[in-house]
């Protein structure tokens, strides 16, 4: 038994990290492997993950960690029974996949302006929680083509638009995402959609 | 509520021994490493030891090693210090804190006033 | 082992000031620092942990900063209960140490 692809570790710099790895060939990842994480620290023990199946040959462990700070480093020790089948270390700060926001809604109730806000997906004392910048994806249902991205540069988890940059008449769906440019991080995880039927009185046209 | 209640201190001759007690309520006790820290009269603090969750990682003061032994009771949520060989410099208030887990003692007990005199 | 010097020894202020106490590490402990404040007859009470991070319910007046060897800890706006002592502790490596720690006094 032999590892093929080495674990690769993204944190979601709260209390999870998820490491991915492939073997030599197919395995019940959850009966031959035990992944050995431990925080390079004081009086620090070693915890142990029981990865699940993640495809024939495809392994996937989520570590769980009471906390997270910068200067954070992890070993990591993959082991079938008793022989040593990797090591390598990890530093949560360095691999950070920010979690993804919630709650997207959008409030068409305002006079030809559509107000969507979400929630920051973490609480105010994670220091992700004031650095995350984030990106709205809006679709049309009825037309493919119809599919644009608005980034949003500001803290505040909100974002207007003039709902006459829309087509009337039809439905959309938005998601958003979100990173932070403090720890480079990759972007998170799409949001669920939220649908809305987009109708704005036209402007009356004077000949 | 997060609590720490130290006992076994008292007046003792130097050259004897004494242990002392924390009891821990109000957390998960085996996830936590725990410690000894303690203050001499009009003094500043200082570390004396500590000890891992399962007690696999444990570190002295270089001021007690070889008289001083740390050790726990997961099963009854309580952390000891067994003092040999006791001297006139021991004598201080001990007190039991918990490990923050990032280096730091979130919480301690009100401390265990250990007299070291003949 | 790991010196931890805290400076000043002592410091008097008026309520209503800012007040910053520093300490320094003899060798680097990247931001493995807490702050304590001790009152007399009380045990220690922690403020800051891993050098900068607020503990919960303390009040924001108190702020803590710095990696390396040099941290320093804020206090704006002193009220009268923060008159007492203050240390700071590493936690980079053993054995533990403390400052020999800051008394804070009223002018």
């Known amino acids: 038994m032999k590892v093929l692809q080495e674990p690769t570790c993204v944190s979601d710099y709260m209390s999870i990290s998820t490491c991915e790895w492939k073997m030599n060939g197919p395995t019940n990842c959850s009966t031959e492997l035990r992944l050995l994480y431990q925080l390079v620290f004081l009086l620090s023990e070693a915890h142990t993950c029981i990865p699940e199946n993640n495809g024939g040959a495809g392994c996937v462990c989520h570590l769980l960690m009471d906390d997270v700070v910068s200067a954070d480093n992890y070993t990591l020790d993959l082991w079938a029974g008793q022989q040593l089948l990797w090591k390598g270390s990890f530093k949560p700060s360095e691999h950070v996949k920010p979690r993804a926001p919630g709650n997207l809604t959008v409030h068409t109730n305002v006079s030809d302006t559509l107000l969507l806000t979400w929630s920051n997906p973490y609480p105010p004392d994670n220091y992700l929680y004031n650095h995350l910048t984030y990106a709205v994806n809006i679709w049309s249902e009825n037309d493919p083509a119809d599919f644009r991205i608005y980034n949003v540069t500001y803290l505040e988890p909100s974002l207007r638009i003039a709902a006459s940059t829309l087509k009337s008449g039809i439905s959309y769906r938005a998601r958003v995402r979100a990173w932070a440019q403090c720890y480079n991080t990759t972007w998170s995880e799409w949001s669920p959609s939220t649908k809305w039927h987009n109708s704005y009185r036209e402007p009356f046209e004077q000949h | 509520e997060v609590q720490l209640v130290e006992s076994g201190g008292g007046l003792v001759q130097p050259g004897r021994s004494l242990r002392l007690s924390c009891e821990a309520s109000?957390?998960?006790?085996?996830?936590?490493?725990m410690h000894w820290v303690r203050q001499a009269p009009g003094k500043g603090l200082e570390w004396v030891s500590g000890?891992?969750?399962?007690?696999?990682?444990?570190g002295y003061a270089d001021s007690v090693k070889g008289r001083f032994t740390i050790s726990r009771d997961n099963a009854k949520n309580s952390l000891y210090l067994e003092m040999n060989s006791l001297r006139p410099e021991d004598t201080a208030l001990y007190y039991c804190?918990?490990?923050?887990?990032?280096?730091?003692?979130?919480?301690w007990g009100q401390g265990t006033l250990v007299t070291v005199s003949s | 082992d790991i010196q931890m010097t805290q400076s000043p020894s002592s410091v008097s202020a008026s309520v209503g000031d800012r007040v910053t106490i520093t300490c320094r590490a003899s060798?680097?402990?990247?931001?493995?620092l807490a702050w304590y404040q001790q009152s007399p007859g009380k045990a220690p009470k922690l403020l800051i942990n891993?050098?900068?991070r607020l503990q919960s319910g303390v009040p924001s007046r108190f702020s803590g900063s710095g990696s390396g060897t040099d941290f320093t800890l804020t206090i704006n706006s002193l009220q009268p209960e923060d008159f007492v002592t203050y240390y700071c502790?590493?936690?980079?490596?053993?054995?533990?140490?403390f400052g020999q720690g800051t008394r804070l006094a009223t002018k």
């Open positions: 804190a918990k490990w923050g887990t990032r280096g730091y003692f979130d919480y």
């Open positions: 109000g957390f998960t006790f085996d996830d936590y490493a």
């Open positions: 000890l891992s969750r399962t007690s696999v990682s444990i």
């Open positions: 060798q680097d402990i990247s931001i493995w």
């Open positions: 891993v050098a900068s």
């Open positions: 502790q590493q936690a980079n490596s053993f054995p533990i140490t």
